[in-house]
């Protein structure tokens, strides 16, 4: 009777568009068929997937965030079959180009400015802000109460993923109109 197999990996936290991962179904056994599933489905046909070592090893080349799924291996022979517990691949990625919300760029004097920055990233990135090139707080949200035309300028959100070693940023121009004028958009 075949034992319950397990999956070993040569890279538990691969980086997107950089690393490859090799899963191996343990143990090695004679006269045994090895099979693989991804999220409960048979392996998709992909040039990035390669089976080797008698189908005992599954290699994913140039991993992407979409590869962060549950991988299961199965073994069978003429009398029994067994399946491993799932192993979920933790793909490190990002940070993607951040998005600043709300999208408004024109504000009335006296309004509160509440900008939120978001970037898709695993793990979550570190956030920081610069106003007209001057560093501000290291937070995801930038809040300034009762803005005036003195707050006109460029607002940049910077994101950094220490695990992937990658950075990204986006710049937004903010215009504050004095009270009594009519900007295109108001907060």
């Amino acid at each position: 009777e075949l034992p319950k197999p397990s999956i070993s990996s040569n890279n538990s936290k691969p980086v997107e568009d950089k690393d490859a991962v090799a899963f191996t179904c343990e143990p090695e056994a004679q006269n045994t068929t090895y099979l693989w599933w991804v999220n409960g489905q048979s392996l998709p046909v992909s040039p990035r997937l390669q089976l080797s070592n008698g189908n005992r090893t599954l290699t994913l080349f140039n991993v992407t965030r979409n590869d962060a799924r549950a991988y299961v291996c199965g073994i069978q022979n003429s009398v029994s079959a067994n399946r491993s517990d799932p192993v979920t691949l933790d793909v490190l990625y990002g940070p993607d180009t951040p998005i600043i919300s709300p999208p408004d760029s024109s504000y009335l004097s006296g309004a509160n400015l509440n900008l939120s920055c978001h970037s898709a990233s695993n793990p979550s990135p570190q956030y920081s802000w610069r106003i007209n090139g001057i560093p501000q707080q290291h937070t995801q949200v930038l809040f300034i109460a009762k803005i005036t035309p003195n707050n006109n300028g460029t607002y940049a959100c910077f994101v950094s993923n220490l695990a992937t070693g990658r950075n990204n940023s986006i710049v937004k121009s903010i215009t504050v109109s004095a009270s009594g004028t009519s900007p295109g958009l108001s907060a």
Partner: nanobody
Framework: EVQLVESGGGLVQAGGSLRLSCAAS????????MGWFRQAPGKEREFVAV???????YYLDSVKGRFTISRENAENTVYLQMNSLKPEDTAIYYC????????????????WGQGTQVTVSS
């Protein structure tokens, strides 16, 4: 969770045929091992046939040549074609999946259907 629903049972005369179906739904695995078992009154549940991940098939000796197990993967359905039925084939027939052990051992299967009654009259 996995659900298995059998159908196709009934009353048939000796020498007749029936085709049992087992439809799987829920968190099933593609091309999973599917087995048929049966239980006659006062007897233990016994292995009848199994189809494994690579479509190899195994049978109880007494049904070899008479029963055929097959599957339709697109429909997540497994079939048991039963020909030349005998009175001793009378039982409740169950389908099972979620294997972790010997094909012929009921305790190796995690998921079971409710069963369908097959009665063969002489």
């Amino acid at each position: 969770e996995v659900q298995l629903v059998e159908s196709g049972g009934g009353l048939v005369q000796a020498g007749g045929s029936l085709r049992l179906s087992c439809a799987a739904s829920g968190r099933t695995f593609s091309r999973d091992v599917m087995g048929w078992f049966r239980q006659a009154p006062g007897k233990e549940r016994e292995f009848v046939a199994v189809i494994n991940w690579t479509d190899s098939t195994y049978y109880l000796d007494s049904v070899k040549g008479r029963f055929t197990i097959s599957r339709e993967n697109a429909e997540n359905t497994v079939y048991l074609q039963m020909n030349s039925l005998k009175p001793e084939d009378t039982a409740i027939y169950y389908c099972a999946t979620g294997i972790g052990g010997l094909y012929r051992r009921p305790s190796a299967y995690k998921y079971w259907g409710q069963g369908t009654q097959v009665t063969v009259s002489s």
